[in-house]
């Protein structure tokens, strides 16, 4: 499988909130004994390789943040702590996978990295990560609402968490 | 905070069957491996089998399939391992374990305190 | 089933010297699981995945390895080292332990 970054860069004004997204696509095994671990972290861009450095997001490692389940569910954080923090993280059963960042501030700036692994019996098997860039603006440059920048040289679109 | 805790020490006779429990507290019982590991004196870590509380499933090491029997309780978060037939091979230290998947990688992420099973005459 | 043999049993050292010992597979292996288990104590998850730190881990200690030979060093080792530890695969069944190094500090 892989993972794709549906946008290579946000740009969102202080006090929005914004849900960043990667997509597992390709064959995915759905056996009985496959699972998912999946989670987010926070990075910069390495010289040798983009997202080999983690960070916390907003004081949540990549483990408070992680979600690890079956190849044919969704999940989400229900932890209170990630709650807390204005983050929640999410899993659908289309392969997307997404964390939500509540009431952005300057301080949310920077690059996010999503992480998927497959995991088969106890055996990480097969791990891919994903990297988006996310600019909080303050002023009247800011935007209204969020912009979200294809990976592609597409359109750009307004996106906002609800 | 994740926390196992295992049934106190028994001291058994030869032939008899034994029943450990790991009760286990603060994450979703039923989603991760429980894991059996037997410790003697002198031999190190040995891993017995493991079960996956949810459903049921089962796996041996085949050198303790016909001593041990894993069982699990989702109402209550409490796996069982039983042992049958003892004999003073059998003495040891019996831990749970719970998988943790950490990084992407599972792995022996948290132990029970131990269980040590003496057989004797 | 895949055998783990660590070396050498037992290990002494004094607090600040340098440390090294290896766990070597009977087959080739993606990485290596570590764990500490102090004198009266339960096994204690270490280094995962051959050379990462388990959170709270001091860095003094690291692991490195790769197929059939792993290592773990301490860089100057401390009285709170004594302890044995253990490698461990999860690749194939049974999962399997290595004997032990047994850590002793003079």
């Known amino acids: 499988f892989k993972v794709a970054t549906l946008y290579s860069l946000y740009v969102c004004p202080e006090g929005q909130n914004v849900t960043l997204t990667c997509r597992v696509f390709g064959p995915v095994d759905k056996g009985h004994d496959v699972t998912f671990y999946k989670t987010w972290y926070r990075s910069s861009r390495g010289e040798v390789q983009t997202c080999s450095e983690r960070r916390p997001i907003r004081n949540l490692t990549f483990q408070d943040l992680h979600l690890h389940h079956g190849g044919h569910q969704a999940a989400n954080t229900s932890h209170d702590l990630a709650q807390r923090h204005g983050l929640e993280s999410a899993s659908d059963h289309h392969g997307n996978f997404s964390i939500t960042m509540r009431n952005l501030t300057l301080l949310d700036s920077g690059l996010y990295c999503c992480l998927v692994v497959e995991i088969r019996h106890h055996h990480s098997e097969h791990r891919v990560h994903g990297a988006m860039e996310l600019q909080v603006q303050t002023g009247k440059d800011a935007p209204s609402s969020c912009v979200a920048y294809p990976s592609s040289s597409q359109e750009s679109e307004n996106i906002t968490a609800a | 905070q994740v926390q196992l805790q295992q049934s106190g020490a028994e001291l058994m006779k030869p032939g008899a069957s034994v029943k450990i429990s790991c009760k286990a507290t603060g994450y979703t019982f039923s989603r991760y491996w429980i894991e059996w590991v037997k410790q003697r004196p002198g031999h190190g870590l040995e891993w017995i089998g493991e079960i996956l509380p949810g459903s049921g499933s089962t796996n041996y090491n085949e050198k303790f399939k016909g001593k041990a029997t894993f069982t699990a309780d989702t109402s209550s978060n409490t796996a069982y391992m039983q042992l049958s037939s003892l004999t003073s091979e059998d003495s040891a230290v019996y831990y749970c374990?719970?998988?943790?998947?950490?990084?992407?990688?599972?792995?022996?992420?948290?132990w029970g305190q131990g269980t040590l099973v003496t057989v004797s005459a | 089933q895949i055998v783990l043999s660590q070396s050498p049993a037992i290990l002494s050292a004094s607090p600040g010297e340098k440390v090294t010992m290896t766990c070597r597979a009977s087959s080739s292996l993606s990485y290596m699981h570590w764990y500490q288990q102090r004198p009266g104590s339960s096994p204690k998850p270490w280094i995962y995945?051959?050379?990462n730190l388990a959170s709270g881990v001091p860095a003094r200690f690291s692991g490195s390895g790769s197929g059939t030979s792993y290592s773990l060093t301490i860089s100057r080792v401390e009285a709170e080292d004594a302890a044995t530890y253990y490698c461990q695969q999860w690749s194939s069944n049974p999962y399997t332990f290595g004997g032990g190094t047994k850590l002793e500090i003079k």
């Open positions: 995945a051959t050379s």
């Open positions: 374990a719970s998988e943790e998947v950490y990084d992407g990688y599972p792995w022996f992420g948290y």
